[in-house]
């Protein structure tokens, strides 16, 4: 009879075991285990009747189609075999074991005791057949196996071969190299590769196979397994395979498709091709006079580009437009996209006007072309070139006037300072009475008129100031402070300020320059209680033209000490002589209280301690700070007064031979101006030099050398 066994392990014994088996018996055990396993059989006990070639009693182990072993007897002889320690392995998942005893047993034989178990098949080691083995990597597990692929490959649907995704290759460059995947290593199986060469219309693709050409073929049938096909429009070239590469192919098209097919077997190295775009040839080019063509080639084809440039000092001229370079291109029809342009000498054109300056041409005929030369100079004696620049500019290859130091920037004509067109009288030890100033004696003197029209009725007052540059006036902060304030310091609105320069006689303003204010800047620390930091600036709406009657005064060096005691200085102003008169009377014409003609006075600087003492002895809270100095005479008689406020107290600087503003008329009192032992108090300008430069937006070094030279 037959016993079906499906367990993963088990025991098989001869009938009646461990007693002797009966005669004339036949039993078959069919063992089936799952796929991926094989059956291992071994015997723990074996005792059967011996016979030649196991004719009588035996145990036969077989598969569906093959006998694996036949056992009988007790020990192995030449003609009979016992299992002993031998293990029987089935090739597959099925094993059949048949026990047979004949009709007579001379002795008592105990039979056999056998065990079986399912053991895993290592498919990765045992598969020799290429059709079944993994293409790249094999992974065994109990009961089965699976395949995987190298990086860049994809497992085919057959779960065995490794293919590549290579259907999306686009080539747009004019030359290139295309190869089978992994070239020169064997190409992947089961792959469909598509390579597209797509060039601009006008080009034609030429193909050339190179190096190795090795595609699986067949001796009789043309390319049944692996092949290359080349598709040009509707026309298909190929298939190509084997070891002989196709001849060079001129496609006559700008668009080419290359198809490469591989099946699931074979180990071939593949192929490599280079492609090149060909186009129409364009005529030979001649470079322009004073110019060159790049790149310089014997022949030019479609899409070749050339750059036309000119020698230094020349510009490309095309259709009356100047440019640095001009590019032309070889077109698909074999013509150039443009004619070769000409090279024209660079022209810097008329040089820029220099404010307060002049231009002279060094080159004949006032030429403004490449390498021509011009010279800027300043309107002397009122302006001087900053940093003593040469003022020489050359027409550069870039078409701009260039200076060795300043580059393309124009020089700066700075106002000369502290040099009146008329010499001030030599200073004497004793004061001579206030006197009329000749025109041009104090060219920095400014009359500042403030008319606050925002109040009804209007407020109106005036003061003096000193011109520092073509755009800036230095004055006292209290002149430009809104008067309707108690202790707060608010500047007057710039719209309410008018500045007169070059004014000599207030009755005749026709010769003067009047300017409105663009900015009013009071010192941020100005104190209305004690007039400390009594300094301010007015920026004029437009720079004023300098001349014999309008010139700036120089600023001093930064010196905390200020002017030395007993030094004589000059102050000018249209200040009033009668302090009880109102400003309306002062400003209205015909009044005698305002001096019509600019007056000036010489005053000595008073030692600081003496001045402090003279004010401390008075009733009232007077404070002469380190930001102030005093000038005047103990016996009085000459002084500055109302209306002179903000005017410059100037001292001649022997080093620079210029007049320097050391003080600004600030305050005095409480007695009448010019009273005995009532010194005028002046803002010490040398303490504010940095602040002034900062407000004017100029570095100190710009102007200081003029004072120190």
């Amino acid at each position: 009879h037959t016993v079906e066994l499906n367990n993963m392990f088990g025991q098989i014994q001869s009938p009646g075991y461990p007693d002797s088996y009966p005669s004339d018996s036949e039993v078959t055990w069919n063992i089936t285990v799952p796929d991926g396993f094989r059956i291992k059989l071994y015997f723990m006990h074996f005792n059967l009747e011996s016979s030649y070639l196991c004719e009588y009693d035996y145990v036969k182990v077989e598969t569906e189609d093959q006998v694996l072993a036949t056992f009988c007897g007790r020990e192995t002889t030449d003609t009979e075999q016992t299992p002993g320690q031998e293990v029987v392995l089935s090739p597959g998942s099925f094993m059949s074991i048949t026990f047979r005893s004949d009709f007579s047993n001379e002795e008592r034989f105990t039979g056999f005791d056998a065990h079986y178990m399912a053991v895993d098949v290592d498919e990765c080691k045992e598969r020799e057949d290429e059709e079944l083995s993994c293409d790249h990597y094999c992974h065994n597990y109990i009961g089965g196996y699976y395949c995987s692929c190298r990086f860049g490959y994809i497992l085919h649907t057959d779960n065995r071969t490794c293919r590549v995704e290579c259907s999306d290759n686009l080539f747009t460059q004019r030359t290139g190299v295309i190869t089978s995947p992994d070239f020169p290593n064997p190409y992947p199986k089961s792959s469909e590769c598509l390579y597209t060469i797509e060039l601009e219309e006008g080009f034609m693709v030429n193909l050339q196979f190179e190096d190795i050409f090795d595609i699986e073929d067949h001796p009789e049938v043309p390319c049944p397994y692996d092949y290359i096909k080349i598709k040009v429009g509707p026309k298909v070239l190929g298939p190509f395979c084997g070891e002989k590469a196709p001849e060079p192919i001129s496609t006559q098209s700008h668009s080419v498709l290359i198809l490469f097919h591989s099946d699931n077997s074979g180990e071939n190295r593949g192929w490599r091709l280079s492609y090149r775009a060909a186009g129409n040839e364009c005529p030979e080019l001649q470079p322009p006079v004073h110019g060159k063509i790049e790149p310089s080639q014997a022949k030019y084809f479609f899409k070749d580009q050339v750059l036309v440039s000119c020698d230094t000092g020349y510009k490309v001229l095309k259709d009356n437009v100047e440019m640095d370079t001009f590019q032309i291109e070889c077109l698909k029809d074999g013509t150039w996209s443009n004619k070769i342009p000409t090279c024209k000498i660079v022209d810097c054109r008329a040089p820029g006007e220099l404010e307060h300056g002049l231009i002279t041409f060094s080159t004949r005929n006032n030429l403004t072309t490449y390498k021509s030369e011009i010279k800027y100079s300043c309107q002397e004696p009122y302006y001087k070139m900053l940093n003593n620049n040469t003022g020489i500019y050359t027409c550069s290859a870039q078409g701009v006037w260039m200076n060795k130091v300043l580059g393309r920037s124009l020089p700066t004509c700075l106002p000369e300072c502290g040099q009146p067109s008329r010499s001030l009288p030599s200073l004497v030890k004793r004061i001579i009475g206030g006197r009329n100033a000749e025109p041009g004696l104090f060219p920095w003197q400014a009359l500042i008129v403030v008319e606050d029209t925002s109040r009804v009725p209007n407020d109106k007052w005036f003061g003096s100031g000193a011109l520092l540059s073509a755009s800036w006036i230095l004055t006292a902060a209290h002149v430009l402070r809104s008067q309707r304030r108690d202790t707060t310091v608010i500047p007057v609105s710039k719209e309410h300020v008018t500045v007169y320069l070059g004014l000599h006689d207030v009755r005749d303003k026709s010769g003067a320059v009047n300017s409105s204010a663009a900015r009013v800047v009071l010192h941020p620390d100005f104190n209305i209680q004690n007039y400390n930091h009594d300094i301010a600036l007015v920026q004029l709406q437009e720079p004023v033209p300098l001349g014999p009657h309008v010139m700036p005064v120089c600023l001093p060096r930064l010196e905390p000490e200020g002017p030395a005691p007993h030094m004589l200085g000059l102050v000018a102003g249209w200040g009033i002589s009668n302090p009880n008169v109102t400003v309306d009377e002062i400003i209205s014409s015909g009044t005698r209280t305002l001096s019509d003609v600019l007056q000036y006075v010489k005053l000595p600087v008073v030692p600081h301690a003496e001045c402090k003492t003279s004010y401390e002895s008075r009733s009232g809270n007077y404070s002469v700070t380190e930001n102030m100095f005093c000038a005047g005479y103990y016996e009085g008689g000459k002084d500055t007064c109302l209306g002179d406020s903000g005017g410059a107290f100037v001292i001649f600087d022997d080093l620079s031979q210029r007049w320097v503003v050391q003080g600004l008329v600030s305050w005095g009192g409480p007695e009448e101006c010019g009273s005995k032992q009532v010194y005028g108090v002046y803002t010490k300008v040398s303490n504010y030099v940095d602040w002034v430069w900062e407000q004017m937006g100029l570095p100190q070094s710009v102007v200081e050398p003029q004072v120190e030279r």
Epitope: S454, R455, V456, P457, D459, W461, R484, T582, V583, L642
Partner: antibody, heavy 113, light 112 residues
Framework: QVQLVQSGAEVKKPGASVKVSCKAS????????IEWVRQAPGQGLEWMGE????????DYNERFKDRATFTADTSTSTAYMELSSLRSEDTAVYYC??????WGQGTLVTVSS | DIVLTQSPDSLAVSLGERATINCKSS????????????LAWFQQKPGQSPKLLIY???TRESGVPDRFSGSGSGTDFTLTISSLQAEDVAVYYC????????FGGGTKVEIK
Amino acid sequence: QVQLVQSGAEVKKPGASVKVSCKASGYTFTGKWIEWVRQAPGQGLEWMGEILPGSGSTDYNERFKDRATFTADTSTSTAYMELSSLRSEDTAVYYCVRSEDLWGQGTLVTVSS
Amino acid sequence: DIVLTQSPDSLAVSLGERATINCKSSQNLFNSRTRKNYLAWFQQKPGQSPKLLIYWASTRESGVPDRFSGSGSGTDFTLTISSLQAEDVAVYYCKQSYIPFTFGGGTKVEIK
């Protein structure tokens, strides 16, 4: 002619705000200060502050700094005074003044619950 | 802030007689730069807006009768009506023009 015309009388509840307008004509509105002065019933004049319409600059009496806001619309030549957190003692006639010389007709603001 | 003290609080004067009102300031109102005293006088008739009479302590506003005059400097100022007319019955205020501006308490002028 040169004049200042103010908005009409207002009745407000305590805690509310009031905005009085003052329309100028006959002169350059932007260039002159507009002052605000109030007068409680049977009382004297009290200066509240001022605005220069062209620049928007303002000055406030400290008493009103936290509650009063002066603004000006130059396109319509109109100045505004807004007083917030009203209380009964804010009941007064409010005047706008062109820098002392020209007075509006006044706006009575009554604050009552 | 500058305080202005007006005296008397009220004043009864016969028609044609002189009326004098005083205004005292807690601070000097003279500005040495503009040479002006920033003090003004206003008249307010019942039910009307105030009207400017005098500015800068002594300058009469245009259209104001010359019987009105102002005087004083520094801290002490006076408004004088040289010959009182019936239409002059009003409350008169002084005002100083340093920010913050302030008014005097007012003086009521009546006909005796």
